[in-house]
Interface confidence: medium
């Protein structure tokens, strides 16, 4: 807390202008007024104020806006940003892109601090979904923002927001997230030809399932085996030595490097071993010829 | 990146007027009070006007008061330097410079003389 | 406006510590904490080097360092290099205006 003192004769600060760097906190304190700092905030940015001095300011904000900053002082906090606590942020109404891009730039180059998340999930609740634009923006920003969201949250992306997503906005998700993204992937890109298709889609694939899987073994798209790798164990396995083989096309190959790495290696299991030796990759560990074939699934399922 | 171009200076005779003009880019000038400077050959440097970023206030060094005029054009990122009855002690390199206090982006300079 | 008061020369053998004094008045060094250093090479414009008395802008190496006592400012360049010979000017605001030292050369020996 500053204590309250009376502002030296000539101090009184007329305008938010750089002389305010010379000023003690107690100065600060006592020769700004918070209604004319809230007008001029813009300007606080193009001046270099110390940390403790921009804890004055921000105090004399609170003060101000004890139930939060109105927009109009939020688009320009600028590095006053940096003090704010996620407490003080849950406080605020922010509705404009802008208000949010002006934020994240300040943090911009560092990792998604608390009080930028809070900041993300207040506009996001305030707008009901996560639009294409709020996702454009964030994406710009954070690209890894997208699998930092709950399946939950997921859900409430509409699928034409998938257009904004690039595939290194998904490197960090996990194969729940993909599953709720898949599908939205689908439906945004379904009217696309083959080739764009798959170019469009492959990111999503880890939450592909095995009928989808099979139908793009039918279109030559050649996968590649970074995004094999990525698919769920679950949709692989039911695949075929020839859906496995088309799907691939002349990836095919890298199957031998990671035979002992799932999917690929669960996948080898389920597979007859005269089928993989068609594929003359050495590869081994299929069941052996002669043996039966029992669908453990099915027979549950029945019983 | 960030920069400030004098220009206008050169060879005035005493009594005669020059206009000096300094543009700035790479930052939000109109955000940024802004300052000459000006350093006489061989000697050291001199303040001589600073203005505001609104433009709402002016100082002058007493050497230069009712004969200098500072202003600036926002939407045009420049500042100004119109110099009346200009004498032989104002020869001298002028810079300008940003801010109003301290100045930490400096033009090159732009010589002015005055002589007969 | 009344310059502020800087020796004409110092100087300095390679890593040793200068300092350089600026003496005002009650009105202008004294007043405030709005005193700032600068660094200027023959022949090019000058370079902000400490501004509010101590402060450094990035950039500017931590070899350069600044302090005040009553209507004195002082600059200490310490592990002097090569690079530093240059004239060095303090400045400070004065009621509504800026006064400039007469400039310091740093010689280095």
């Known amino acids: 807390e500053v204590e309250k003192t009376a502002c030296p004769s000539g101090k009184k600060a007329r305008e938010i202008d750089e002389s305010l760097i010379f000023y003690k906190k107690w100065e600060l304190e006592a020769c700004v007024d918070a209604a004319l700092l809230a007008t001029q905030m813009d300007r606080v940015n193009a001046i270099p104020f110390t940390y403790e001095q921009l804890d004055v300011l921000k105090h004399k904000l609170d003060e101000l806006y004890p139930q939060g900053y109105p927009e109009s002082v939020i688009q320009h906090l600028g590095y006053l940003f940096l003090k704010m606590s996620p407490e003080d942020i849950r406080k605020w109404n922010v509705t404009s892109l802008e208000t949010l891009k002006a934020l994240l730039e300040v943090n911009k180059g560092h990792e998604m601090s608390p009080q930028v998340a809070t900041l993300i999930d207040r506009f996001v609740k305030g707008r009901g979904q996560l639009d294409k634009d709020t996702l454009d923006t964030l994406t710009a920003f954070y690209p890894g923002y997208l699998c930092s969201l709950s399946p939950e949250e997921l859900s409430s992306v509409p699928p034409s927001s998938i257009w904004a997503v690039r595939p290194q906005d998904l490197d960090t998700c996990d194969p729940r997230q993909l599953d709720v993204l898949y599908p939205k992937a689908r439906l945004a890109f379904q009217n696309m030809n083959g080739s764009e298709y798959f170019v469009k889609i492959q990111s999503f694939l880890g939450g592909a399932p095995t009928e989808d899987l099979k139908a793009l073994s039918q279109q030559n798209v050649s996968m590649d085996l970074a995004t094999f790798m990525k698919l769920r164990t679950d949709a692989v396995l039911p695949l075929t030595v020839a859906e496995v083989q088309k799907l691939l096309g002349p990836h095919v190959e890298g199957l031998k490097a990671e035979e002992r790495h799932r999917p690929v290696r669960d996948w080898i299991l389920r597979q007859r071993q005269d089928d993989l030796d068609t594929l003359g990759l050495g590869l081994q560990g299929g069941i052996p010829n002669g043996y039966l074939v029992l669908d453990l699934s099915m027979q549950e399922a029945l019983s | 990146q960030v920069q400030l171009v004098e220009s206008g200076g050169g060879l005035v005779q005493p009594g005669g007027s020059l206009r000096l003009s300094c543009a700035a880019s790479g930052f939000t000038f109109s955000s940024y009070g802004m300052s000459w400077v000006r350093q006489a050959p061989g000697k050291g440097l001199e303040w001589v006007s600073g203005?505001?970023?609104?433009?709402?206030?002016?100082y002058y060094a007493d050497s230069v008061k009712g004969r200098f005029t500072i202003s600036r054009d926002n939407s045009k990122n420049t500042l100004y330097l119109q110099m009346n009855s200009l004498r032989a002690e104002d020869t001298a390199v002028y810079y300008c410079?940003?801010?109003?206090?301290?100045?930490?982006?400096w033009g090159q300079g732009t010589l002015v003389t005055v002589s007969s | 406006d009344i310059a502020l008061t800087q020796p004409a020369s110092v100087s300095g053998a390679p890593g040793q510590r200068v300092t350089i004094s600026c003496t005002g008045t009650s009105s202008d060094v004294g007043a405030s904490d709005t005193v700032t250093w600068y660094q200027q090479h023959p022949g090019k414009a000058p370079k902000l080097m400490i501004y509010a008395v101590n402060k450094r802008p990035s950039g500017v190496s931590n070899r350069f360092s600044g302090s005040k006592s009553g209507n004195t400012a002082s600059l200490t360049i310490s592990g002097l290099q090569a690079e530093d010979e240059a004239d060095y000017y303090c400045a400070s605001r004065d009621s509504s205006s800026m006064v400039f030292g007469g400039g310091t050369k740093l010689t280095v020996l």
């Open positions: 203005i505001s970023y609104s433009s709402s206030a002016t």
């Open positions: 410079a940003r801010y109003l206090y301290y100045f930490d982006v």
